[in-house]
Interface confidence: medium
């Protein structure tokens, strides 16, 4: 679903390049099946992330945790609407849930998109501060700052998604038996300016919800990679493997984010450019037909987050094991890790060991010169 509305795809009968559009046909139950899979994995995964974050004691949480939790909340609130969209698609675009749920579930898609991207950006910036400027910006990474940043990003996400809540409606567009959930610009735009509204909302959502955050993320990770690469040359061979793994995780996270959202934003942008550049019909048709699948891929991101951003952390895996253990033998969640620490918040900014830069038994750690050595690089 998008914030867009109708596309005047008409080309006159006497125009040699007229496009012969037809009703879009989904590939049967494929998209609804993917939506339901994302729903199941997303509710389980994001629920697990939230459980892991909130079960840890408050003093053990750091600034990154609030972004992780927000991200999981955003994904969770979105994926619970997917059964509605699965039903809508499966019923060949007949919306049986009424106007309120059309508005709400459409709104949650965009709140999720913005909140997720902003959480990712916040998390990336938090990692940047932790790794590149650990001492100078320590105060910036306090829990209070994280809470304020999260509040701001949620308000911003809620406001940016508001046009969808206002303009989405249900209607029997042709007085047939089917009811659609669609964008209706008639309350804010004249016939001639509807396209301008659609393009305006489309460009702004892509800019604010993808281009700007992704640029910030890439910048953060560029400096993170630079810092890590600098230490490749300085450190012992044993430490090299760890650094390389951290860098590869970062690459996986950024690439996954790009792979999930790039097709959606790219196709949407190309479609909007089409009205100016007049693409060949075949390409125009290709964009129209592939867009639902691009949307589907972007939705998949909401269930990948727990796996990509949390499961890479051994402490998260340990927390999951702890939970399974609790379910079976009623242990109180105090299982100890090999380093003697409790199974703490999986994404806390610093190690919860005996002391700063201290290893097991309190001995000075060899990597004390590396500010990020005890950071958990979790990013969504």
């Amino acid at each position: 679903m998008e914030e867009g509305g109708d596309f005047d795809n008409y080309y006159g009968a006497d125009n040699q390049s007229e496009c012969e559009y037809t009703d879009w046909k989904s590939s049967g139950a494929l998209i609804p099946a993917i939506y339901m899979l994302v729903f199941l994995l997303g509710t389980t995964g994001n629920g697990l992330v939230l459980w892991t974050v909130f079960r840890s004691s408050r003093e053990k949480r750091r600034s990154a945790d609030i972004f992780i939790a927000s991200l999981a909340v955003a994904d969770l609130t979105f994926v619970v609407t997917l059964p509605l969209w699965a039903t809508y698609t499966y019923r060949d675009y007949d919306w049986p849930f009424g106007t309120f749920f059309c508005k709400l579930s459409s709104y949650l898609i965009f709140v999720n998109m913005y909140a997720s991207v902003f959480c990712l950006t916040g998390l990336s910036f938090d990692r940047y501060l932790a790794i590149v400027r650990p001492v100078a910006n320590a105060r910036l990474r306090l829990r209070v700052s994280g809470a304020v940043a999260t509040a701001v990003l949620w308000v911003l996400a809620a406001l940016l998604a508001m046009p969808v809540m206002v303009l989405r409606t249900t209607g029997d567009l042709e007085n047939t038996t089917k009811v659609q959930c669609y964008m209706d610009y008639s309350m804010v735009a004249t016939v001639s300016s509807e396209w301008a509204w659609e393009v305006g909302l489309g460009v702004s959502s892509t800019t604010v919800g993808f281009v700007v955050p992704f640029t910030i993320m890439l910048t953060c990770y560029f400096f993170i990679a630079q810092t890590i690469a600098g230490h490749f040359r300085k450190e012992r061979i044993e430490g090299l493997r760890k650094r390389r793994r951290l860098l590869s995780i970062i690459v996986v996270l950024v690439v996954t984010f790009a792979l999930c959202w790039m097709p959606y934003h790219l196709v949407k942008t190309l479609y909007m450019l089409g009205s100016l550049l007049h693409w060949p019909c075949d390409f125009d048709l290709f964009l129209m037909n592939i867009f639902p699948y691009c949307t589907c891929i972007s939705y998949v991101n909401s269930c990948l987050n727990p796996f990509l951003y949390a499961f890479f952390d051994p402490r998260f895996r340990q927390a999951c094991t702890s939970m399974l253990c609790c379910g079976q033998s009623r242990c109180a969640g105090t299982s100890h890790s090999s380093s003697g620490e409790k199974s703490a918040s999986y994404s806390s900014g610093h190690s919860q060991g005996p002391g700063p830069n201290m290893g097991k038994g309190g001995e000075q750690m060899h990597e004390k010169s590396i500010p990020y050595s005890q950071e958990t690089l979790v990013v969504d």
Epitope: N9, T22, D23, L173, Q180, M183
Partner: antibody, heavy 129, light 107 residues
Framework: EVQLVESGGGLVQPGGSLRLSCAAS????????MSWVRQVPGKGLEWVAN????????YYVDSVKGRFTISRDNAKNSLYLQMNSLRAEDTAVYYC??????????????????????WGQGTTVTVSS | DIQMTQSPSSLSVSVGDRVTITCRAS??????LGWYQQKPGKAPKRLIY???SLQSGVPSRFSGSGSGTEFTLTISGLQPEDFATYYC?????????FGQGTKVEIK
């Protein structure tokens, strides 16, 4: 050249049947909705029926429901109108026309009807005893 | 069914005149209205769709406007070939309904 040619019109008695055909050429017939529109001589236009590309959706004006059946054969690029239980008021020139829709890029399943952009020259049906 | 009322039913004008034809819908039809031109013995030809979008190949002297229930077709600077009957068509809901037509004659 985009072209629609109607045939099958003629004189028929009240209560009789007639089958109109429309041969399409110059465009991908299977990609378009198609309509039948009629015009009583010296009077205005009246939309009669239309049919989706694959024939899965059909709509009719109330006055012909249960008597007329619209159908198509995409392999033959042909549109048909089977008219049964004909009445004197069905006397008219019958036009075959190509429908145009705008499709929502974002909201799949949403389409906007843009009227009929290509028309045939018409075939005359006279219902008289 | 949505009733479409066209006015005037006929008008006599000179070449070069500005012509305005109005079409009223019995209920709101958003911008789902088209305008057709028909000459005697010929099939109708679409001029405008979706209230104001000009069919390709149609001269720019034809323009459409309106929204909801009131719509207008304007011919700015009537040409000899424009003398014909004009129909509006609502394409908001089934059944599609035409206006009764406006005949534009030479004065």
């Amino acid at each position: 050249e985009v072209q629609l040619v109607e045939s099958g019109g003629g004189l028929v008695q009240p209560g009789g049947s007639l089958r109109l055909s429309c041969a399409a050429s110059g465009f991908t017939f299977s990609s378009f909705w198609m309509s039948w529109v009629r015009q009583v001589p010296g009077k205005g236009l009246e939309w009669v029926a239309n049919i989706k590309q694959d024939g899965s959706e059909k709509y009719y004006v109330d006055s012909v429901k249960g008597r007329f059946t619209i159908s198509r054969d995409n392999a033959k690029n042909s549109l048909y109108l089977q008219m049964n239980s004909l009445r004197a008021e069905d006397t008219a020139v019958y036009y075959c026309a190509r429908d145009r829709f705008g499709y929502s890029f974002y909201d799949k399943g949403v389409r906007y009807y843009y009227g009929m952009d290509v028309w045939g020259q018409g075939t005359t049906v006279t219902v008289s005893s | 069914d949505i009733q479409m009322t066209q006015s005037p039913s006929s008008l006599s004008v000179s070449v070069g005149d500005r012509v305005t034809i109005t079409c009223r819908a019995s209920q709101g039809i958003r911008n789902d209205l088209g305008w057709y031109q028909q000459k005697p013995g010929k099939a109708p030809k679409r001029l405008i769709y979706a209230t104001s979008s000009l069919q390709s190949g149609v001269p720019s002297r034809f323009s459409g406007s309106g929204s909801g229930t009131e719509f207008t077709l304007t011919i700015s600077g009537l040409q000899p070939e424009d003398f014909a009957t004009y129909y509006c068509l609502q394409h908001n809901s089934y059944p599609r309904t035409f206006g009764q037509g406006t005949k534009v004659e030479i004065k």
